[in-house]
């Protein structure tokens, strides 16, 4: 039985040309994290491994850099990075447990950096 | 450099037995997943099996599971296929493969050929 | 179980061509797509993972797009030593299933 859950900061927003810290944090079980993938709308950014550690997928190894932790930093946004980011959890014995982020990159100085919003 | 060396192939009648196995080499045995996947004569690729990098977890298709056995000896850098109740449909080239993170197969052996005929 | 269909399953090219194969799932794979080159009497070499990543020190004349179902292997210019046999492969889930693969051939 899966009893853990994803803890994640949310919706964030963050400014056009800065970085943001993406970051999920898997409480309430026992079972062994085995790896982390970060996806980003069908697209692999990046993955760690418990044995093997960091992968960052070629196209984003200029931009994407791992950690803390679990996490992953993004770096130089863009507009474009815009939407929903998700952390798969592989764990044993559990299985998969899934958070989701979603991230609004703003043109001027609006942003709250790595802080919650709302949207209106 | 890595390297993966299948043995244990060769011609065997239906119904009977064979062990395969897979030295690997140039790389930390232990952390990856390993599969076997099959190529019969002139036909596409066919995945058979894989194992955890620990050996706690196995999957099998279908059509080898309950006659197929994978295995690894972690200490000897090894992983193994034990094949019972071959058929002649189980005819094929025998590619051992690793699997970084689960995703992709970066590397495969150069494959040894099991042959089940009467 | 995943169905993978790739089409053509065989064509014909020249050298310089652009060369397009296509690779269908039967249900969403998200990322979850390699591409393999296969010569005769050799084993399969990883040409693209995770449908659109080039595998390290394959040229960059291949390319890999696409999500969910539908993917495509693109090859910019086709190099004597391209002429092989192609397959897409699903790790989305198991059982792992390949695609028939694509023969491309010289014109």
């Known amino acids: 039985m899966m009893t853990g859950t994803i803890e994640t900061t949310g919706n964030i927003s963050a400014e056009k040309g800065g970085s943001i810290i993406l970051q999920c944090h898997l409480s309430s079980t026992t079972a062994q994290v085995t790896q982390v993938n970060w996806e980003q709308q069908d697209q692999l950014l990046a993955i760690c491994n418990a044995d093997l550690g960091w992968h960052i997928s070629p196209s984003f190894k200029d931009r994407v850099a791992p950690g803390p932790g679990l996490g992953l930093t993004l770096q130089s946004l863009t507009v474009n990075d815009t939407g929903e980011y998700f952390c798969i959890y592989h764990t044993y014995p559990d299985g998969t447990y899934t958070g989701r982020i979603f991230l609004e990159v703003l043109e001027s100085s609006v942003a709250e950096h790595g802080a919650r919003f709302q949207i209106p | 450099e890595v390297q993966l060396l299948e043995s244990g192939g060769g011609l065997v009648q239906p119904g009977g037995s064979l062990r395969l196995s897979c030295a690997a080499s140039?790389?930390?045995?232990?952390?990856?997943?390993m599969s076997w996947v099959r190529q019969a004569p002139g036909k596409g690729l066919e995945w058979v099996s894989a194992?955890?990098?620990?050996?706690?977890?196995?999957y099998y298709a279908d059509s080898v599971k309950g006659r197929f056995t994978i295995s690894r000896d972690n200490s000897k850098n090894t992983l193994y296929l034990q094949m019972n109740s071959l058929r002649a449909e189980d005819t094929a080239v025998y590619y051992c493969?690793?699997?970084?993170?689960?995703?992709?197969?970066?590397?495969w052996g150069q494959g040894t050929l099991v042959t089940v005929s009467s | 179980d995943i169905q993978m269909t790739q089409s053509p399953s065989s064509l014909s090219a020249s050298v310089g061509d652009r060369v397009t194969i296509t690779c269908r799932a039967s249900?969403?794979?998200?990322?979850?797509l390699n591409w393999y080159q296969q010569k005769p009497g050799k084993a399969p070499k990883l040409l693209i993972y995770?449908?659109?990543s080039l595998q390290s020190g394959v040229p960059s004349r291949f390319s890999g797009s696409g999500s969910g179902t539908d993917f495509t292997l693109t090859i910019s210019s086709l190099q004597p030593e391209d002429f092989a046999t192609y397959y897409c492969?699903?790790?989305?889930?198991?059982?792992?299933?390949f695609g028939g693969g694509t023969k491309v051939e010289i014109k």
């Open positions: 492969q699903q790790s989305y889930s198991t059982p792992l299933t």
């Open positions: 493969a690793r699997e970084p993170y689960g995703v992709w197969i970066d590397y």
């Open positions: 140039g790389f930390t045995f232990s952390s990856y997943a």
């Open positions: 995770a449908a659109s």
């Open positions: 249900q969403s794979i998200s990322y979850y």
């Open positions: 194992i955890s990098g620990s050996g706690g977890s196995t």
